[in-house]
């Protein structure tokens, strides 16, 4: 008689998920000398160690602990990206920019980058037909409590000017909802950080509006200056031209406004 | 519970050197769940990071404070230390010695515990 599993309203664990956050976690310890004493066996089975045999619904930052620890990577703290509804752009950025860093680049956020997993109750077994999803089912599901823990401490670890990329062409520009709006901008310190930097990417080609001005932007800018942290903020009108002047600044198309 | 207490001189002369110590109680200094630093707070000024210094003894220092600042770890006492040399009146302020727990992404900056701070005043 096959068991009774739990059914849920979210994909499954990625495929080859073991072998990804392996391969993964060789891949950037050989590329990062700093990271070269990390042993990835243990990073895997403190991975492995924060969501099986518990339920999925029933995660906390506690079981994340063994990994976060192996994890500790030191960023240069006033060289963070966050970034919102945005990604691709941000990661294009620092690609480029090899100084600054998003979560991404660092070895946590590398290793779980578009993977979804979970498991199940008292049960080894790693669920790959279905996981909790994070409105339907329940927001303390594995996924969303890794990027909860490892996004609360990158926010902590930022200092002097802070820098966050958002995606101009959404209804909400800022969201209060997004891993930047309920965790990152909480988690600034203010005595550390002196001012937070909004760079907000415009879509269209011909769009010329100033989206600094956006409603939410400035729902932002009130968040932000009731925690004493000062707020600006910039319009990327092209974001094409922005990537290709931080590749080449000498450009003289470059002076311009981007 | 994590508790750091600094110590030093309140006065020191111009061109010379500051010495201050940290004295960290609760837990061992030389536990790989940490890292230690010292910040300072110029009187009217914004906190201002000085330097670090890891569980592997690699130290990182503020580029503006580089060549003068020296920090380095006593483990018998379960204490670490700050110097910093050729002192003029822009480095009188508030010290507080500081550790943050090694954990996930990490700033150079520990801001985890953090002492109660030592007013450091440099004048002849």
């Known amino acids: 008689v096959p068991r009774w599993r739990q059914q849920w309203s979210g994909p499954g664990t990625t495929k080859r998920f073991p072998e990804t956050v392996l391969a993964r976690c060789v891949k950037y310890t050989e590329i990062h000398p700093e990271m070269r004493h990390v042993d990835c066996q243990s990073v895997w089975d403190a991975f492995k160690g924060a969501f099986i045999s518990k339920h999925p619904c029933n995660i906390t930052e506690e079981d994340y602990q063994p990994l976060m620890k192996l994890g500790t990577q030191t960023v240069p703290c006033n060289k963070i990206l966050l970034w919102s509804r945005i990604k691709d752009l941000a990661h294009q950025f620092t690609q480029v920019q090899r100084d600054m860093f998003t979560l991404e680049d660092t070895l946590l956020g590398y290793l779980a980058d578009d993977l979804t997993w979970c498991g199940e109750f008292n049960t080894s077994k790693i669920n790959y037909q279905s996981c909790p999803d994070w409105r339907k089912d329940c927001s303390n599901n594995p996924v969303s409590v890794f990027w909860k823990t490892v996004s609360r401490r990158f926010a902590e670890a930022a200092c002097d000017v802070v820098h966050v990329m958002l995606n101009g062409s959404r209804s909400k520009i800022f969201d209060k909802n997004s891993t930047f709006g309920s965790v990152e901008v909480h988690n600034l310190q203010p005595e550390k950080v002196q001012t937070l930097e909004a760079w907000v990417i415009h879509g269209g080609r011909e769009d010329s509006r100033d989206l600094c001005q956006d409603p939410t932007i400035k729902e932002l800018e009130s968040i932000i200056s009731k925690r004493n942290i000062q707020f600006s903020c910039k319009n990327i009108y092209r974001p094409d031209k922005f990537l290709q002047c931080v590749k080449n600044p000498e450009d003289s198309s470059c002076t311009s406004e981007i | 519970q994590l508790q750091l207490q600094e110590s030093g001189p309140g006065l020191v002369k111009p061109s010379e050197t500051l010495s201050l110590t940290c004295t960290v109680s609760?837990?061992?200094?030389?536990?790989?769940?940490?890292?230690w630093g010292w910040i300072r707070q110029p009187p009217g000024k914004r906190l201002e990071w000085i330097g670090s210094?890891?569980?592997?003894?690699?130290?990182n220092y503020n580029p503006s404070l580089n060549s003068r600042v020296t920090i380095s770890v006593d483990t018998s006492r379960n204490q670490f230390s700050l110097k910093v040399s050729s002192v003029t009146a822009a480095d009188t302020a508030v010290y507080y010695c500081?550790?943050?727990?090694?954990?996930?992404?990490?700033?150079?900056?520990?801001?985890?515990?953090r002492g109660q701070g030592t007013l450091v005043t440099v004048s002849s």
């Open positions: 609760g837990d061992s200094i030389s536990s790989s769940s940490y890292y």
């Open positions: 500081a550790g943050g727990d090694t954990y996930g992404p990490v700033g150079q900056w520990p801001s985890d515990y």
């Open positions: 210094i890891y569980y592997s003894g690699s130290t």
